[in-house]
């Protein structure tokens, strides 16, 4: 199916131009989305182009400024947050990035009633995390790894924890591995629905081995960055969950929530916390061997001022074919009775679907079913459940929003988005106001992205929030590549692929082929989304065919494909890329002497292994920030898929699946290896070991390091990186500069 039809006609050809690398590096064709900052059922805030904070009222159709750009500028604020009682706004400035989600900042509290900043008992700086209570204007914040509470912004703080210590004890914020691989947030504290209680995690990293790397900076001596980072098989953080009554915090102090006995018997993780009511909380735990997850519902005992987690309220989720969940174990969405909930997990046929759990998981009622997957539950109201799935027309790389009426029997299902803008929009997400009175739909493609506002009862479109008109106009004279999403059936495996073809593509001609690969467990590369990026340029200007293939281990097509790679990373992902390349050659328009592969992170690992597969298919390839041995990567991620690197578990495959073990096989390919020296995620160590193995095997290769750059290679490094990779590929494919 052709997703982005070419607008090229002979009469227009003279005025049309190809994409340039400069276009990509300048972000000329980037798009905007609009996510309302909901503050009620019918109101949202949005930061206007001139930086005013504006309140929009959907029902009146009116808007007004609640915070002027003058106020924002007075403290150089880049972000804001309105207190639920609408009396105060926090203004965030001096943003300083730490890891993927975490950052520190300076916070100022502005009183909307009097138009002045709150003076007296100002917040310390820099703060690691700050948030309002869900009701009123209490503040919780983390400073120097300790949690503080303010009843009102101008009040003195109450210190909740005292043991916080850099790189040792983390309160209310995750350590490196929990941030990156488990919580995927910068915070580890959660207010109860009405702000009565505050739950928080304490992470003890005292015994975790430390990764140390040089940060060169501008000084005479480099700094050493030290991060407690558990690699596969290493000592893990010790986690504890506490809850404190924020009304009388000094009364009994923080109370620890007990860990289920079957979890506490060996190493374990805390995976998420969901408040149900002010006096009921749901915690999810996971064994270190991540095929057993326990969901535990705990109740506040007024008499003892403690939290009780009866065994009858423990729900076990176990996988016998792989790990528990998809990338993460899914979180529950509770219904109005405050005990039953909706949750996505594998059904008996091995597809992830929504289930309704009333008493036990064994008695769960399956809500969705089919050879497709439910992906996210957005909202449950009294009468509707909104979710996304890839059911429509059997394309795994699409996302549509559905509504199931749970108030009526039998429940009826309606696709809210399937037929809205069918050609333009096949990949949606949604954002709901209180009680799902209204919602915003954000369409990511395959056409130009568009964000729209809808009535939560009728699903009627109310208005367009962002339609990227400027982008549409800018693209009018650009020769964009054609894109198609199709599938290959090979040995009972379905391999979906996206092919990006030059604008004047002619099947009778031969083109160089570049495979772009990620291929990590539970990932998906073949998606019906809009993008004008580096590979668009390579197709448009340099005449390459680019292909992305979702092989075994990828997501949203059932457990058989997903769990195929369990305990065997680096085997089937590579095989499936190679199989796809052979199929592409059979199509007749690929120049088999000019085939390359490239990838970043997990994709760098797969591209390296593919180049070293000994097939002779690839002339050249690039690995950016690759993993080279699973012994070098984080415990939480690696062990989920590989088990432990011990003799009695899976050490053999850990050793067999390294890039270094295949050093000899790089002799007949051109290899470009790239890594940032300050990569906190996939450590530079990975590429250092590849380089050492290649040198020891006397294999020639090319390399580029980016000093003081992390896993994202951002800023000026990005420009240098893509320019460098472009030169490498053009040389490999004998394309003139």
């Amino acid at each position: 199916i052709v997703l982005r039809p070419s607008r090229v006609h002979n009469s227009e050809e003279n005025t049309m131009r190809a994409l340039t690398l400069k276009d990509i590096l300048n972000g000329t064709f980037s798009y905007k989305t609009f996510f309302p900052n909901w503050i009620s059922g019918q109101e949202y805030l949005h930061q206007s182009a001139d930086n005013n904070i504006v309140l929009y009222n959907i029902e009146t159709g009116q808007s007004y400024t609640i915070l002027s750009n003058r106020t924002m500028k007075s403290v150089n604020a880049s972000n804001y947050g309105l207190s639920p009682d609408r009396q105060f706004v926090y203004l965030e400035s001096d943003y300083s990035k730490l890891w993927r989600y975490s950052y520190t900042a300076t916070y100022y509290i502005y009183d909307l009633s009097n138009g002045e900043f709150v003076r007296g008992n100002e917040l310390p700086r820099p703060i690691q995390y700050l948030c309002w209570s869900p009701v009123g204007s209490k503040l919780a914040y983390v400073y120097q790894n300790n949690i503080y509470l303010k009843q009102r912004p101008g009040d003195p703080p109450f210190q909740i924890t005292f043991n916080g210590r850099e790189n040792k004890i983390f309160n209310g914020i995750p350590d490196w591995v929990y941030e990156e691989e488990m919580l995927a947030t910068k915070y580890a504290l959660w207010w109860s629905p009405n702000g009565k209680f505050l739950a928080y995690a304490e992470f003890n990293d005292t015994d975790i081995p430390v990764i140390a790397y040089s940060y060169y900076g501008d000084e005479q001596y480099p700094r050493t960055i030290n991060i407690p980072y558990p690699k596969a098989g290493a000592k893990n953080p010790v986690v504890r969950i506490f809850i404190i009554d924020t009304t009388y915090p000094a009364y009994v102090g923080p109370q620890e929530v007990p860990v289920p006995a079957m979890i506490a018997s060996s190493d374990y993780y805390f995976s998420w916390l969901t408040w149900v009511t002010d006096e009921r909380v749901c915690l999810q735990w996971l064994k270190r061997v991540q095929n057993v997850s326990v969901l535990s519902i705990c109740d506040f005992r007024e008499d003892w001022q403690t939290w009780d987690c009866p065994k009858t309220q423990e729900h076990i989720e176990e996988s016998r074919t792989g790990w528990a969940g998809g990338f993460f174990v899914s979180t529950p969405v509770f219904s109005y009775d405050a005990i039953s909930y909706y949750k996505i997990f594998s059904d008996k046929d091995g597809y992830k679907h929504i289930h309704y759990i009333k008493d036990t998981v064994e008695n769960a009622i399956q809500i969705t079913s089919g050879k497709w997957e439910a992906i996210n539950i957005f909202r449950v109201t009294q009468d509707s459940l909104f979710y996304s799935s890839n059911e429509f027309e059997e394309y795994p790389g699409r996302r549509n929003i559905y509504r199931i009426s749970i108030g009526s029997y039998p429940p009826s299902k309606k696709c809210v988005t399937c037929h809205l803008r069918k050609e333009r929009c096949q990949y949606y997400t949604a954002s709901f106001s209180d009680y799902a009175k209204y919602y915003a739909l954000v369409c990511y493609g395959p056409g130009i992205p568009i964000s729209t506002l809808h009535d939560g009862r009728t699903d009627q479109e109310i208005k367009i929030l962002e339609e990227n008109k400027e982008l549409e106009n800018a693209l009018k004279n650009i020769q964009l590549p054609k894109e198609e999403i199709k599938k290959l059936e090979v040995d009972e495996i379905t391999l979906w692929y996206k092919m990006i073809l030059p604008p004047q593509f002619d099947r009778s001609k031969k083109y160089p082929l570049l495979i772009q690969v990620y291929g990590g467990p539970c990932s998906q590369s073949v998606r019906s989304v809009f993008a004008v990026n580096w590979i668009s340029y390579l197709a448009s200007k340099e005449g390459m065919v680019i292909a992305l293939v979702d092989g075994r281990g990828t997501a949203f097509q059932g457990d058989k494909l997903l769990y195929a790679v369990y305990r065997k990373l680096g085997v089937y992902e590579v095989e499936d890329q190679i199989t796809a390349v052979r199929k592409f050659i059979e199509m007749g328009f690929i120049d088999e002497k000019r085939i390359a592969i490239w990838g970043w992170s997990y994709g760098g690992y797969v591209s390296s292994l593919a180049l070293a597969s000994g097939t002779g298919l690839f002339k050249c390839g690039i690995a950016v920030a690759p993993v080279s041995s699973w012994e070098y990567y984080a415990s939480v991620y690696t062990e989920r898929f590989m088990g432990l690197p011990t003799k009695d578990d899976n050490l053999e495959h850990y050793k067999n699946s390294t890039v270094m073990a295949r050093a000899e096989y790089f002799r007949n390919v051109d290899y470009l290896l790239i890594h940032g020296t300050a990569d906190d995620n996939v450590h530079f160590q990975n590429s250092a070991q590849i380089a050492k193995a290649l040198v020891n095997a006397q294999v020639d290769f090319q390399a580029m390091w980016y000093s003081d750059q992390n896993h994202g290679l951002s800023g000026l490094s990005t420009n240098h990186l893509y320019t460098h990779m472009t030169h490498f590929l053009k040389q490999c494919f004998s394309l003139s500069d």
């Epitope: 109101e43 005013n52 002027s68």
Partner: nanobody
């Protein structure tokens, strides 16, 4: 054009009562959260009471138990019933959206003067 017109202020003795009214035009009152604010001479403006679209209310600590905010959506009017008035309640009382519209208050809103004598 949205307009807010306050009335009901006046001079009253300590312990007395007043009922302030705010007629809202140019918008749908029922869809807006509203607030009563006040500013005493030489003091900062402060929120006295607010009422959300679902009718839930919020009060400044200094007026809790004495003042009551309410609304009559049919009449597009927001009220502030003030009982057991104290001299420190003396101020100009303004009606506004909640959170308030950012404007120069003096220019836009006349307010209504409440003076409590001892």
């Amino acid at each position: 054009q949205v307009q807010l017109q306050e009335s009901g202020g006046g001079l009253v003795q300590a312990g007395g009562s007043l009922r302030l009214s705010c007629v809202v035009s140019g918008t749908i009152l029922s869809s807006n959260s509203m607030g009563w604010y006040r500013q005493a001479p030489g003091k900062r403006r402060e929120l006295v009471a607010s009422i959300s679209t679902d009718g839930s209310t919020n009060y400044a600590d200094s007026v809790k138990g004495r003042f009551t905010i309410s609304r009559d959506n049919a009449k597009s009017t927001v009220f502030l019933q003030m009982n057991s008035l104290k001299p420190e309640d003396t101020a100009v009382y303004y009606c506004n959206f909640h959170p308030p519209v950012v404007r120069d208050w003096g220019d836009t809103y006349w307010g209504t003067q409440v003076t409590v004598s001892s």
